[in-house]
Interface confidence: low
């Protein structure tokens, strides 16, 4: 036998209180699939949490953050602070990197410079809070037509740059 | 590279105590060092943490006021005042797993093996 | 403050067995969540760090999975050597957090 409640589309519930009929959902609430019993709470997007996709019947509210703030989390589940390029969040707010480390971005840890010197090449141009070091070529790398600068090292996610 | 924590008595109540972690191996100013304690036969208990590169402090809420952590180039201190028999316990001190100030590297990956203080009249 | 809850207080199973290790945060720690393991008389020892990233030397048995505000340790293929308490530790200070306790409450893991 098949359920009634199967023929609810996304956007309704199967309203037990009324015989199995399928009911629009209320305000402020939403179901994205079929079917469903109740209709689940819309997300609010509140305090320092922007709406970037308003709540429908079958979709749920999506959030960004305010400008000075970026997301953290599964869907945006938290919003935290930026920092300038060449310092990084710490538990006392934003402070610069220190001697020797590069942030080049308004999120994640300051990272050390990279060190030309293990790879056998001299130092083109002198690191920054804010930038890495830039390594010319290996003294035997200078033939004509070959590139001058080495990139940057990749940026690494926070909690895992070297020691 | 390790850390060694020393200190740990016998004091009466009221007294004032001050732990010491000391370090070997590497330079405290780059890293968050914590306290942590652990009474007989009960979990851990964060007391607060410094980070050696600014010297900023940190502690849980009820230990604020009473309990006050500094450090020097390869100290870390906890001093400790007012003592109840509450306050019996291991102390631990612990060095962060990677250096620099960002709160993503505040997890523990070296630890002393503690010093016992007992509170008791 | 944010609160850190694990549950179970204690769980017994047997040797080749599974446990799972609940922690709960009182609200979202995105990622930033740890897991450590004690035995009696030794200092704590970092299992996994970043929700699921183990640290070198510690057993793929080990997983770690979660996010936001609820975290899994599960301990497969048991062995006698993992008898141990189990914490977990929440470390995201953004937006001004504040935790009375960083760890949890522990978890006894007694293998039979």
């Known amino acids: 036998l098949q359920d009634p409640c199967s023929n609810c589309p996304a956007g309704t519930f199967c309203d037990n209180n009324r015989n199995q009929i399928c009911s629009p959902c209320p305000p402020n609430s939403f179901s994205s699939a079929g079917g469903q019993r109740t209709c689940d709470i819309c997300r609010q997007c509140k305090g320092v949490f922007r709406t970037r996709k308003e709540c429908s019947s079958t979709s749920n509210a999506e959030c960004d953050c305010t400008p000075g703030f970026h997301c953290l989390g599964a869907g945006c589940s938290m919003c935290e602070q930026d920092c300038k390029q060449g310092q990084e969040l710490t538990k006392k707010g934003c402070k610069d990197c220190c001697f020797g480390t590069f942030n080049d971005q308004k999120r994640g840890i300051c990272r050390p410079w990279t060190n030309c010197s293990l790879a056998g090449k001299p130092v083109l141009m002198n690191g920054t809070k804010a930038r890495d070091v830039v390594c010319g070529p290996r003294p035997a790398d200078l033939s004509p037509g070959a590139s001058s600068v080495t990139p940057p090292a990749p940026a690494r996610e926070p909690g895992h740059s070297p020691q | 590279q390790s850390v060694e924590e020393s200190g740990g008595r016998l004091v009466t109540p009221g007294t004032p105590l001050t732990l010491t972690c000391t370090a070997s191996g590497f330079t405290i100013s780059s890293y968050h060092m914590i306290w942590v304690r652990q009474a007989p036969g009960e979990g851990l208990e964060w007391i607060g943490d410094i980070y050696g590169g600014t010297a900023t402090t940190d502690y849980a809420s009820w230990a604020k006021g009473r309990f006050t952590i500094s450090k020097t180039s390869t100290t870390v201190d906890l001093k400790m005042t007012s003592l109840t028999t509450e306050d019996t316990a291991t102390y631990f001190c612990?060095?962060?797993?990677?250096?620099?100030?960002?709160?993503?590297?505040?997890?523990?990956?070296?630890w002393g093996q503690g010093t016992l203080v007992t509170v008791s009249s | 403050d944010i609160v850190m809850t694990q549950t179970p207080a204690s769980v017994e199973a047997a040797v080749g067995g599974t446990v799972t290790i609940k922690c709960q945060a009182s609200q979202s720690i995105s990622s930033y969540l740890a897991w450590y393991q004690q035995k009696p008389g030794q200092p704590p020892k970092l299992l996994i760090y970043r929700t699921s990233t183990l640290e070198s030397g510690v057993p793929s048995r080990f997983k770690g999975s979660g996010s936001g505000t609820e975290f899994t340790l599960t301990i497969s293929d048991l062995e006698s050597a993992d008898a141990a308490t189990y914490y977990c530790q929440g470390y995201d200070w953004s937006s001004s957090n504040r935790y009375d306790n960083t760890f949890g409450g522990g978890t006894e893991v007694v293998v039979k």
């Open positions: 612990a060095r962060a797993r990677y250096s620099g100030g960002s709160y993503a590297n505040y997890v523990f990956n070296l």
